[in-house]
């Protein structure tokens, strides 16, 4: 029944090529290279991938051939280090090439850039895309993998293969349709939005492993899988957690071939053992490999077993609590987390982890006390405020969302977060606050029992985006503190931040509030971003501005844009009315 008990292979590269097949092998090597060397041109990467593939084929033919016994890190690292323009393009990353494995790979990993200086992907006309697709389907799909991978250096590689398969299917279907655009554009929008969400979710997994360690990731996985598979026994959940941890450790570490191979094995194991895991897996397990793995990862929670006994008997009332804890601390805590999580699909994973941490802290203290039972007897009472805090926060914010709608709810969050951490760059504040604001439409529609896991676990993903972007250019001690102290308390830490009283308001710069006629041709989303950028800048200039003052200025701004976009001479309108707006805004805010 073991998944990862493979015999040693003479040639690792031949082993992976045979396991994955040529198409997946090439795609995964391309993703790996693009995630490491994010600035390299597409053609250079394709050349490197072809060279690696040809070499792999020689190893398949003869595993004893020269260099076939080398590790994948050695082979891939050597290949990356042949890039001629490494120092000019990547600066100090070129120093990685002077190191030996495993330090060289660690060095490449440290230079992955979450916010690379790359142009925004502009979608060509549908006819242009369809022509390119028909002219050279293989190159077209490789280009998709390359462009996504270099912009999302932690994208979950086997899942990117699934996205590419859907991308290909969309073009295959829609380029033959009568109305190509009506068919294709909604599909591409959906893939884009799902892709961004997938990237952000995986980024949190990698941050969890890299910044907080394997134990933190395993705890997250125990909680989530116990919610999803409440009928599975603890031993089964433990096994799945161990295997899943290996898969994500590999992908986050750049070992994409091993990761994809092991993910396929894990999906196979789950489907072979679905009777002992979950009744919801049947449909997933009938699908082809990429769809199957995706489906399992997204599968709905199974029904909870009937008549589960009270947790108190084994974890509070039993005289053996301290003995069982001392015997195997992590197993006992894992069992506590499993039992709590399978009973509470209505809690967020991070809340479950806070409860487990509180339980652990209590046992550490009480098992050393004179009367341990007396000491830990009320431990479940300590959970009440921890549960109520996210419940109340979600209730308040969903009420606000329902009252304001998404755009204005995002604006409320923009103001709130700019006041908390005004040192953070405006683009980051806009991006993060917009995403935080999406929690409303994503989660507030759910019934009470699904709101918390939807909202708080989504907020963890978004706040991790803030943390990784801030880590690249740290500007706020408060952000650093909330990001690094505790993974599960990030959201409560940010929620608890008040207005930063130490912040010195930004000097007023009229240029920041100067707009041109090009705003009129922007999409609604891009226009919103322009307005929200201005709102953040306003708050940075006047952090003590009231909601009413900011609302008045933003209303005036919206009216100004609408008026000038309807004017015959738009540019003149923006110039003249813009000056008036800036003056009126300064007066209104007392700038």
């Amino acid at each position: 029944r073991g998944v990862f008990r493979r015999d040693a292979h003479k040639s690792e590269v031949a082993h992976r090529f045979k396991d994955l097949g040529e198409e997946n092998f090439k795609a995964l090597v391309l993703i790996a290279f693009a995630q490491y060397l994010q600035q390299c041109p597409f053609e250079d990467h394709v050349k490197l991938v072809n060279e690696v593939t040809e070499f792999a084929k020689t190893c398949v033919a003869d595993e004893s051939a020269e260099n076939c016994d080398k590790s994948l890190h050695t082979l891939f690292g050597d290949k990356l280090c042949t890039v001629a323009t490494l120092r000019e393009t990547y600066g100090e990353m070129a120093d990685c090439c002077a190191k030996q494995e495993p330090e060289r790979n660690e060095c490449f990993l440290q230079h992955k850039d979450d916010n690379p200086n790359l142009p925004r992907l502009v979608r060509p006309e549908v006819d242009v895309m369809c022509t390119a697709f028909h002219d050279n389907e293989e190159t077209f799909l490789k280009k998709y993998l390359y462009e996504i991978a270099r912009r999302h250096p932690y994208f979950y590689a086997p899942e990117l293969l699934f996205f590419a398969k859907r991308y290909k299917a969309a073009f295959t279907e829609c380029c033959q349709a009568a109305d190509k655009a009506a068919c294709l554009l909604p599909k591409l929008d959906e893939l884009r939005d799902e892709g961004k969400a997938s990237s952000a979710k995986q980024r949190l997994k990698c941050a969890s492993l890299q910044k907080f360690g394997e134990r933190a990731f395993k705890a997250w996985a125990v909680a989530r899988l116990s919610q999803r598979f409440p009928k599975a026994e603890f031993a089964e959940v433990s096994k799945l957690v161990t295997d899943l941890t290996k898969v994500h450790t590999e992908c986050c570490h750049g070992d994409l071939l091993e990761c994809a191979d092991d993910r396929a094995d894990l999906a196979k194991y789950i489907c072979e053992n679905q009777d002992s895991i979950s009744s919801k897996l049947k449909e997933c397990c009938e699908k082809p490999l990429l769809e199957k793995s995706h489906c399992i990862a997204e599968v709905e929670n199974d029904e909870m077993p009937a008549d589960l006994p009270s947790l108190a008997a084994d974890f509070v009332e039993s005289k053996d609590v301290c003995k069982n804890y001392a015997e195997a601390k992590d197993v006992f805590l894992g069992m506590f987390l499993y039992e709590y999580a399978r009973r509470h699909p209505d809690y967020s994973v991070v809340l479950l982890l806070r409860l487990a941490k509180t339980y652990e802290t209590t046992l550490e203290k009480c098992c050393a006390a004179a009367d341990p039972h007396e000491c830990y007897a009320k431990v479940f009472d300590e959970f009440k405020p921890l549960v109520e805090e996210p419940q109340n926060l979600i209730k308040q914010n969903c009420e606000l969302f329902e009252q304001l709608g998404e755009y204005k709810f995002q604006n409320a969050l923009l103001v709130r977060y700019t006041k908390k951490v005004p040192q953070v760059s405006t683009p980051t504040l806009v991006e993060v606050s917009r995403n935080l604001g999406k929690v409303g439409s994503k989660c507030c529609k759910h019934p009470e029992a699904k709101r918390m896991p939807c909202a708080e676990d989504y907020l963890s993903v978004v706040l991790n985006q803030l943390c990784v972007l801030h880590e690249k250019t740290p500007v706020s001690d408060r952000v650093t503190k909330c990001c690094t102290e505790s993974l599960v308390n990030r959201r409560p830490c940010f929620s608890a931040l008040e207005v930063d009283e130490t912040y010195v308001p930004k000097e007023f710069n009229a240029e920041t509030f100067t707009f041109h006629a090009d705003i009129c041709t922007l999409s609604e989303k891009e226009r919103q971003i322009k307005k929200q950028t201005a709102l953040v800048e306003l708050v940075k200039h006047k952090p003590k501005a009231t909601k009413e003052q900011l609302k008045a200025v933003m209303d005036d701004f919206a009216a100004f844009v609408e008026k000038c976009c309807k004017a015959d001479d738009k540019e003149t309108c923006f110039a003249e009315e813009g000056k008036k707006l800036v003056a009126a805004s300064q007066a209104a805010l007392g700038l």
Partner: nanobody, 118 residues
Framework: EVQLLESGGGLVQPGGSLRLSCTAS????????MGWVRQAPGKGLEWVSW????????YYADSVKGRFTISRDNSKNTLYLQMNSLRAEDTAVYYC???????????WGQGTLVTVSS
């Protein structure tokens, strides 16, 4: 401290039956997957069968399916293995094992020898 004590082994003719028992102490028996592992002379360890903590799900190696039945009594902290239609290839030391992980067992007993021979 965890203790697993097997009993019920012995010499039996091909086609015969035996019932192995394993009495557990030192841990909360009802929390853990329990199983039987065997080691034939000169061979490695092999999972024979395991049972979920609540007894609702069982697994059997292909070589024993339809002949062996695993069961447990959580009120008595005891695990059983009913072995019918025994064959010469079932000859082995049978160990009772405690597992917190589907791929691993963390404790096992001293073992009881089952010899199937005419």
């Amino acid at each position: 401290e965890v203790q697993l004590l097997e009993s019920g082994g012995g010499l039996v003719q091909p086609g015969g039956s035996l019932r192995l028992s394993c009495t557990a102490s030192g841990f909360t028996f009802r929390h853990y997957r329990m199983g039987w592992v065997r080691q034939a002379p000169g061979k490695g360890l092999e999972w024979v069968s395991w049972i979920r903590p609540d007894g609702t799900f069982t697994y059997y190696a292909d070589s024993v399916k339809g002949r062996f039945t695993i069961s447990r009594d959580n009120s008595k902290n005891t695990l059983y293995l009913q072995m019918n239609s025994l064959r010469a290839e079932d000859t082995a030391v049978y160990y009772c094992a405690k597992s917190y992980h589907a791929d691993k067992f963390d404790y096992w007993g001293q073992g009881t020898l089952v010899t199937v021979s005419s």
